[in-house]
Amino acid sequence: FVRTKIDTTENLLNTEVHSSPVQRWSMQVPAEVSAAAGDAAVLPCTFTHPHRHYDGPLTAIWRAGEPYAGPQVFRCAAARGSELCQTALSLHGRFRLLGNPRRNDLSLRVERLALADDRRYFCRVEFAGDVHDRYESRHGVRLHVTAAPRIINISVLPGPAHAFRALCTTEGEPPPALAWSGPALGNGSAAVPSSGQGHGHLVTAELPALNHDGRYTCTAANSLGRSEASVYLFRFHGASAST
């Protein structure tokens, strides 16, 4: 249920010093990992370093958004000689270290994915014993979260000249296509997303004029599924309209 593509290597491996290969700092991460909302995903990250058999204290860190400055989502620390990296930070309790930093593996597990997790993540390791050194991936791994459409709001609002308009907001990835159907609209009348309303994974479509009483249905669809929701318009003639 998790897809990974294109391995990238940052600052690759070894140089020759007196004909003895010495590892340089490098981090290997895939360009992208794809998983469905609700599932778990693994963000792979392995590294090499020049400090042969380092056994001192270390800290493993993952941050989101941008390298070096992005907010930390996970941090753990391992004491000298220990293979256990004790978690000090796990945002919302959903991030867990899958890899073993002592074996040059910082791979991270993200539980119960949400569309908001769709961003780039950067791994970092810090040595703090006799050796003081650190390294962070520069390009990171993009976590691509997919989701079937979910209509999160459908409403009828007052419009100009005692008319009414309808708004339908959905989320999903790929971004869903929205269509309205209802009285005098025909079957599956497409509604163009309102200008500037495609925000992140949210898509909003407006039906600008509801001219007839009855049921109006918003349908959202993408390659992973479809969802629909309805509103009903009933006007009390001779008084102000209501829904």
Partner: antibody
Framework: QVQLVQSGGGLVQPGRSLRLSCAAS????????MHWVRQAPGKGLEWVSG????????GYADSVKGRFTISRDNAKNSLYLQMNSLRAEDTALYYC???????????????WGQGTMVTVSS | QSALTQPASVSGSPGQSITLSCTGT?????????VSWYQQHPGTAPKLMIY???NRPSGVSDRFSGSKSGNTASLTISGLQAEDEADYYC???????????FGTGTKVTVL
């Protein structure tokens, strides 16, 4: 209090079917993975199957793959194990168990049912 | 996959410390820090004592502690008490499918 109450065990002939149920209470059922673990008489524990919080991910032991089906109904706070083509070697005490995490595969089992005996014999 | 290896029995006197071992491979215990320990008294369901190598669930006595070195995980019971007499099983995540493997079990006897 937090508990898992099991039902559905019994004596069944080889080749027949049986369905085990596990009713959960005292915790938010749809936040956690759930599992079935069995223990043959006088033997150790064997993981049978696990299911993630939303049924999006499911796993089985090789010994039951293709014959057993795990499922859950989050609206009813219930876990099920449909056992088909039963064999004598499936005879065991079957436990349902709550996981610590939403995903089943990196899990540990912190709450256990009382167990239900399944005996496969002609 | 094959079960993790545990000694069949370990015994100790009240007040003593004993250590139970659980030996796996570089595909399970050695590769991941997802080892759990369960205590089972006769005729009762297992009880989680340790998860993720060294974490104790609430309600579990601090006399129980877990650790790991290489491909071997350990459960130490300090200040051994009569009620500690039970079977103990380890479990580990494994990179093979299915992802769980239990140990063969150790019977702890309090002399």
């Amino acid at each position: 209090q937090v508990q898992l109450v099991q039902s559905g065990g019994g004596l069944v002939q080889p080749g027949r079917s049986l369905r085990l149920s596990c009713a959960a209470s005292g915790f938010t059922f749809d936040d956690y993975a759930m599992h079935w673990v069995r223990q043959a008489p006088g033997k150790g524990l064997e993981w049978v199957s696990g299911i993630s919080w939303n049924s999006g991910s499911i796993g089985y032991a090789d010994s039951v793959k293709g014959r057993f089906t795990i499922s859950r109904d989050n609206a009813k706070n219930s876990l099920y194990l449909q056992m088909n083509s039963l064999r004598a070697e499936d005879t065991a005490l079957y436990y349902c168990a709550k996981g610590l995490w939403p995903s089943y595969d990196l899990d540990a089992f912190d709450i256990w049912g009382q167990g239900t005996m399944v005996t496969v014999s002609s | 996959q094959s079960a993790l290896t545990q000694p069949a029995s370990v015994s100790g006197s009240p007040g003593q410390s004993i250590t139970l071992s659980c030996t796996g491979t570089s595909s399970d215990v050695g590769a991941y820090n997802f080892v759990s320990w369960y205590q089972q008294h006769p005729g009762t369901a297992p009880k989680l004592m340790i998860y993720e190598v060294s974490n104790r669930p609430s309600g579990v006595s601090d006399r129980f502690s877990g650790s790991k070195s290489g491909n071997t995980a350990s459960l130490t019971i300090s200040g051994l008490q009569a009620e500690d007499e039970a079977d103990y099983y380890c479990s580990s995540y494994t990179s093979t499918i299915p992802p769980f493997v239990f140990g063969t079990g150790t019977k702890v006897t309090v002399l």
